[in-house]
Every structure is written in C-alpha cells, then in structure tokens.
Amino acid sequence: IVLRPSRVHNSEENTMRALTLKDILNGTFSYKTFFPNWISGQEYLHQSADNNIVLYNIETGQSYTILSNRTMKSVNASNYGLSPDRQFVYLESDYSKLWRYSYTATYYIYDLSNGEFVRGNELPRPIQYLCWSPVGSKLAYVYQNNIYLKQRPGDPPFQITFNGRENKIFNGIPDWVYEEEMLATKYALWWSPNGKFLAYAEFNDTDIPVIAYSYYGDEQYPRTINIPYPKAGAKNPVVRIFIIDTTYPAYVGPQEVPVPAMIASSDYYFSWLTWVTDERVCLQWLKRVQNVSVLSICDFREDWQTWDCPKTQEHIEESRTGWAGGFFVSTPVFSYDAISYYKIFSDKDGYKHIHYIKDTVENAIQITSGKWEAINIFRVTQDSLFYSSNEFEEYPGRRNIYRISIGSYPPSKKCVTCHLRKERCQYYTASFSDYAKYYALVCYGPGIPISTLHDGRTDQEIKILEENKELENALKNIQLPKEEIKKLEVDEITLWYKMILPPQFDRSKKYPLLIQVYGGPCSQSVRSVFAVNWISYLASKEGMVIALVDGRGTAFQGDKLLYAVYRKLGVYEVEDQITAVRKFIEMGFIDEKRIAIWGWSYGGYVSSLALASGTGLFKCGIAVAPVSSWEYYASVYTERFMGLPTKDDNLEHYKNSTVMARAEYFRNVDYLLIHGTADDNVHFQNSAQIAKALVNAQVDFQAMWYSDQNHGLSGLSTNHLYTHMTHFLKQCFSLSD
C-alpha cells in the first residue's frame, strides 16, 4: 500500500472518472491482438495500420510492402491471401455475412510478377469459399454449392461437382448445422499437404425439415428465409467425403472415402478431416448418439485410385459417463512417422490429457496427467510438443503454454509463459511458424493484452508485436472495477467465480448483485482475461456487484463436473447459480432484496429457469435469445447432451426442462425477454413460446424484439439492447437515472 498526501490523492481522485455506457457502446476501450500471418519458418505478413500488406523477415529484420493500400483500395478489398509460391494474391471484397462463420465475397486475383490483376477466366461472383493449394498457386473455390479447381489463376476452371443445389446439396461448404455445431468453419474442403489431393464433404439436406421465418426488410411483403435445420430428433444431413486427384481431376473423378462399418450401421456424423501426408488422410466419425467416435486412417491406393481404410487403422474413443470429447471430439496431431499421433481425451481419472497413440488407443501412452486439463495441442515438431493447459497454480480459468521435449527420454516439461508477465498475463494462446522456428504469444489478460514474438528454440522474447499503449493511456483516468477470481466449496463441488466489484468497494456496505450466466455444457465464464464491457460499466458507474459462476457442466475441471449435466440439462446449472448466490449473500455485502440474473442464448435459458426456480432470491432478470425447449434446438448440439426426444430415450426430461413448464413461477419476478426475429440459431419460436405460456398463465412480463436481427443482435440493435437492459436493471435496483 502506498500512502499519498491527501491533497494529491484528492486531485487524482477528481481526475478519475467512472466508465460510461457510451464508452462501452463506442468500443472506446477495446484492445488489439497481433496474430502473424505466417508464410514460412521465419516470415509473416501483416496488414499495417494504413492497409499495406507487409512481409516481415524475422531473421534479416527486413520488411517490405508486397501489396500497396492503393491496390487494395482499387477493388475495396477487406481481406487478402498470398499464394504459397508468392506469385499471386487474392483480394476479397463485397463481404456478405451468412451464418456464424460463412459469408460470400467477390474475389480478384492480383499477379505480383507484373503488378496487374489477372484478366481472362475471372472468378464468378459471389463465391462461397476460396483457397490456395498449400504449394504453388492452384485455386479451389465453391460457387453455387459446387466445387471448382484452377491449376493456375488464369486457367479455365475444372468443375469437380455438379449436383450442388441451394438448401439441398452442399459441396465443399457445410450446411447450417455442420457449420454451427460440428465443423465450426465456413469450409468443408481440405487440401493435402502438397496439394496433390483435395478432400471435400458433400452434405445432402434433401430430407431435413426447414425452419422458415419472416425477414421484414423494406419491401411491401416480407421475405421468407428457409433453412434446412434439424431440430432434436429430426432427420439429419447425410454426409459423404470425397477426394479428388487435382493433378488428373478428370481421370477417375472424386473418390468416396468409406465410412467405418461400426459407424455406418446407424445415423452418424463426420466430425473432422486431418491430412497426414499426401497419400494418408485421417477422418473422424461420430455416432448420432454422440458417445462413440471413430478415428479412421486411410491410405491412397494408387492402383485402385481410391482410399483404403483398414480396420487395423480404426481407433475408437468411447465415453461411458457422458458424450465423446469436450465440446467437440479432439483432433489428432500426427508425429513425423506419419502414423502415430497425439490426442487429448479423458484419462482414467476423468481429466482430459494428452495421449500418444502408436498402435491402439488401449495402448496409448499418457503424456500429461494431473487434476487439471490439457486444452490444446498447438504444434508437434521432431523434438517438442507445445500445448496449453490450466495446470499453473490450480486456476482452471488460466491458460499457459508448455513445451514437452519428446526428443529426449524421459520427456521434460517446461512452462513457457508462466513467469513471463505473471500479474499481467495468465491467459495465453500461441501461433507457430513452420517447424515452430518462431512463435507469437497472445496474452488476453487479466491485464491489458499484449502480443509478443519468440524464438522457437530458446523461447527468448524477440519483440513486442502489440502492447496496446493507447489503451493503457486511455485507461489511466478511468475508475475500473476490481476483479477477483475465487472458489466456493459446496457439497464436494468446486464452484469457481469471478466477482466484479465497484471501484470504491467497501465490504461493510450492501450492493445490488447481478449474476451474469452462460452455463452451457463445456463452457467457461470464469477466465483470467481482460475486458472492459457492459458489466464493467455496471460496476464502475452504477455500483453493482457482478458475479460469474462456473457450475456443473462447465469445462476444464474434469469429467465429473463436465458430465454431471448429461441427459439432464437445465437442472444442475441452475442449482449451482442459486447455491452461489446464497453463498454471496453470506459474505455480507450483498443487498439480498436487489439480486438480478441475466444471460444470453444458453445463459438466457439458465437465467429464465433461475428466475422461475421459486426460491425468491431474484428480484428481476433478463433473458436474451434464450432456448426455451430443447426440442426447438439443433440436433447435433442438443442430442450430444440430452439424447433423443423419444419415449424410449429421454423425452420426459425434454418436456420437464422447458421454460414454458414453469410459467406460473414468473409471477413474483420482473422478467425481460429479448429476441431477434431473424435468429437463425436460437429461433424466435423459443421466445414466442415463452411469451405465449406467460400470457396463458396471465403473468405480466416485459419484452423487446429486434426486427430482422440474428442471434448476435449487432449494429444499432446492440446500443438499443444495452441501453434498454440498463434501464431495466436500474429500475429493478431502484437506481436513479
């Protein structure tokens, strides 16, 4: 503690100001990160502040502009991609968002050798996805749900697929449910390491029921948006994987990769594809009942001109206590022998750890162990494996980067980041150059984010890439709330929480409490990251205490906590929020007559159920875009955690866990229900059904819809939303405007 003369203290106090809602809505205190666009072991590209595309060579220290902002501006480019042979750049413009990851765009190819755009055989528009081959300058792209190949940018295209049809057959791009719930990408095609083969998925949505909603626009009649969207228990997309030889694409055409027999015997999903070599590929499949996953390694048979997936190269991953994997089934990282691999899955104690698989999963060698979890394998080189975990000091909401030396025996482990900037940085990710010659560390907090460049052999810091100096200066006169991350031990369950406290917090006073909840399976809200957001403002200016609690069903603390919610969503997540609130009241500084809860999406579901729990703890609450019944949500997500809504499976809990079933219990709380009418993800139907149930029960509530807005409620809707929610909470807590 530093004691200052009161005069100085007071004058400093006077210059300090609280956060305003305007600060938040304007993004005044947003931070920057720096992820190098690696193009070799020691070179990366970066878009400068003035929009030049600059190539940096770490070893020579030189940099030069490969593409000027003038060229970018000539086609209004918002993105770019350099071909691996460095002869061409694609420029992306006319970005038009579709779903979470997908968008269409117009693409122009710029020839760096002559400084001109490629004329002749120009690309059609709009394109759904485009990418260079990993070597040379072949192009693969998806247009109108079909895949095309160009050997060179100026060549005529070779059409690979012909059956693509809007909302029916998707080639090389996922349909809605695969994009959102399985692949988490806008693409479904994968080049082999040297560009010899191109693998792609075909999704057949012909038999999937369609969700239809109105898009009001400006016309006399609204448009109807139709999306093939399988809800829980509905017919799912049929997926097939094909691989085509891009050197001789017309010779045998696309060859289908066989599905393992044990998977093909009932409904299934394709979950990911990993190329091992140009002639070896690894596919992961998942039964519709998502507790069995099969990893299948397939080899190209030149004599067959197709792919052989022997049973001896099938590896089964099964969960007996929950679903397979965490949020997704983890993907393998292959070692240099091109057959053995490293993979994260649960160990015998129920913690997710790195295992080395050489022949069978049963004989896997465990690489990491402990009552913590390995989270991501970044890179495997000849002698090192880089991964992230939350091991350090036993804080599950931290992420540090570790290196295990796999070249020596026994392997030694080193934490690369633990002591770099210990107070400022406890939550890292990393980005590696080829062969891990260099890497960038991106620290997200809890202090102001910073991105640094490091030597891949010595781990020495080479330079700071971005340290957010402007942000640091801007925050100097801001009274930021205090944050603490602690845990509660309740009935053998550890509940980690983050508490955001007003700047002049005094334990002897009473404060209104707002619980912010997400709580979805395999999520984590209590993280050691920096943020200046709406809840920061509520603490700083409005004097609220905000708490985030990770209860049962959340991630990175072992399977016992994670799989506790299996087949019974909406029970323990809510119980644990309530338990935490009771513990917070016991701490003595919470005004128990002024407690609110709010959440978005899954958090809207949990906040609604908490408000309707009948505990009398909550005065008011907000649900933004909530799920209201699991029968309304996507099959892939819902069934992973809930099984099927059939009599012989889990229909009873599907029915018991709806918000509508608890309509009567909203009578004694103030409820604000908010939803976008064009929500492709959690359909407006969910809130419509809540509203109907509340009306039928003659329960008063408040509601706000956002016309033509999706699940993100972006743009001007964001400002309106947070202003509206602020008024609601201030009214609930009797805070003056």
Epitope: Y248, P258, P260, D303, W304, T306
Partner: antibody, heavy 120, light 111 residues
C-alpha cells in the same frame, strides 16, 4: 482408341537380360498405371508389378525384386520392363496391361504379348 | 499373399446352357465400399480380356449375359446362356492387396 503395342519375341541365354517395350496410345499415358503380367507355357497368369508413369511410383512382386526394373519414357508414351539374370523358368509370354481408372485394380487393355524364350 | 482358388478346374457345357464359375479367396478381398475381384477371359494365343471389374461391374463392350457377384471371400462369374465364342479359360484376379494374384483358371469347354 486405347492400344498397347509390345516389342517382338526374344530368345535369350540363361544369365542374360531382356528388355520388353510397350508403347501406349489413345489415352493420356501419365494418368494410368501400367502392369506387367507373365504367363509361362500352358500355365496361369502371374503379376510382376506396376509402374505409374505420372508419379513414377513402382511396385514389384516380392519374388522378382532385385531382378526386375520397370521404367517409362513419357515423351514417347512407352513403358519398359527389364528382367535380369534370366533362367529357364522365366520363359513366358510377357504382357503389359493398362490399369482401368475406376477398375479398382482391374486391367482393361492388354498388349498382344511378347514371347521371351530362355534357352542355352 | 492372397491365394485364389477357382472351381471347377474344367467345366463342360453346351451352348445355350448356364455356366457358373467360382473363385474363393484365402482372405476377404472386400472393403465396406468395394470388392476388389475381377474376371478375365483368355482364348488360345490371345491376351486376356477384362469381363467384370470390382466383383459385379460389367466392362464396356462385354455382352450382358456375363455377370459377377459375391463379396468377402466367395465370388461367382455367371454366363446366363453360353454362346460358342464363350468357350475359353476364365481367370479371377484380386487387387485388394499386393501382390496381385490370379486364380489358376477354369477351362470352359464344349460338351
């Protein structure tokens, strides 16, 4: 149309070498595998190996490993099979055959055959 | 290596009759997608001619009286109505594993 034309009959002494050629036409030579199959008088067919002119990939039957060499000349669309250290039991008709693209290992076009006689 | 055994060694039939030729593999030559078994016809002094590929697919230009069936280890070539030009030696061949192997042949002769 697809044609595979082989070189003429050869008579060789034991211990010598023979090189049989197979000229392809009517398709893109670099796209398809060329197999070599032999048939001793009055006997069945024996697979010797294959070569992919496009990738240069080669597979030999184990029993001939070290004695056989398969090569191609893409400029003339010709495949060659050389067999060294000839023995009397190498006397056979030697066929080249094209690998059918979607045939999964079936041989859809065959050369007319080259009779190689090994005799002292 | 995979050994293919053809039966019978010789089959004596008359034109117009149905011929059934069998080929048994020492281990499965099928995957979930395909059966890697093919059938050839060879006449004296000629090169073999492909009839059926991947167990049941008729090669173009081959009359449809020829058909193939089977999977795993047991395969059959059927000629529904024998024509005079069908009398020859028939070989099965597997391409499931290297080395490729042929059966010893079935001689189809006129009764």
């Amino acid at each position: 149309q697809v044609q595979l034309v082989q070189s003429g009959a050869e008579v060789k002494k034991p211990g010598a070498s023979v090189k049989v050629s197979c000229k392809a036409s009517g398709y893109t030579f670099t796209e398809a595998i060329i197999h070599w199959v032999r048939q001793a008088p009055g006997q069945g067919l024996e697979w010797m190996g294959w070569i992919h002119p496009g990738s240069g990939s080669i597979k030999y039957a184990q029993k001939l490993q070290g004695r056989v060499t398969m090569t191609t000349d893409t400029s003339t669309s010709t495949a060659y099979m050389e067999l060294r250290s000839l023995r009397s039991d190498d006397t056979a008709v030697y066929y080249c055959a094209r690998h059918g693209g979607t045939g999964r290992g079936a041989m859809d076009y065959w050369g007319q055959g080259t009779l190689v006689t090994v005799s002292s | 290596e995979i050994v293919l055994t053809q039966s019978p060694g010789t089959l004596s039939l008359s034109p117009g009759e149905r011929a059934t030729l069998s080929c048994r593999a020492s281990q499965s030559v099928s995957t979930s997608a395909y059966s890697y078994m093919h059938w050839y016809q060879q006449k004296p002094g000629q090169a073999p001619r492909l009839l059926i590929y991947a167990a049941s697919n008729l090669e173009s230009g081959i009359p449809d009286r020829f058909s193939g069936s089977g999977s795993g280890t047991d395969f059959t070539l059927t000629i529904s109505r024998l024509e005079p030009e069908d009398f020859a030696v028939y070989y099965c061949q597997q391409s499931r594993e290297l080395p490729y192997t042929f059966g010893q042949g079935t001689k189809l002769e006129i009764k």
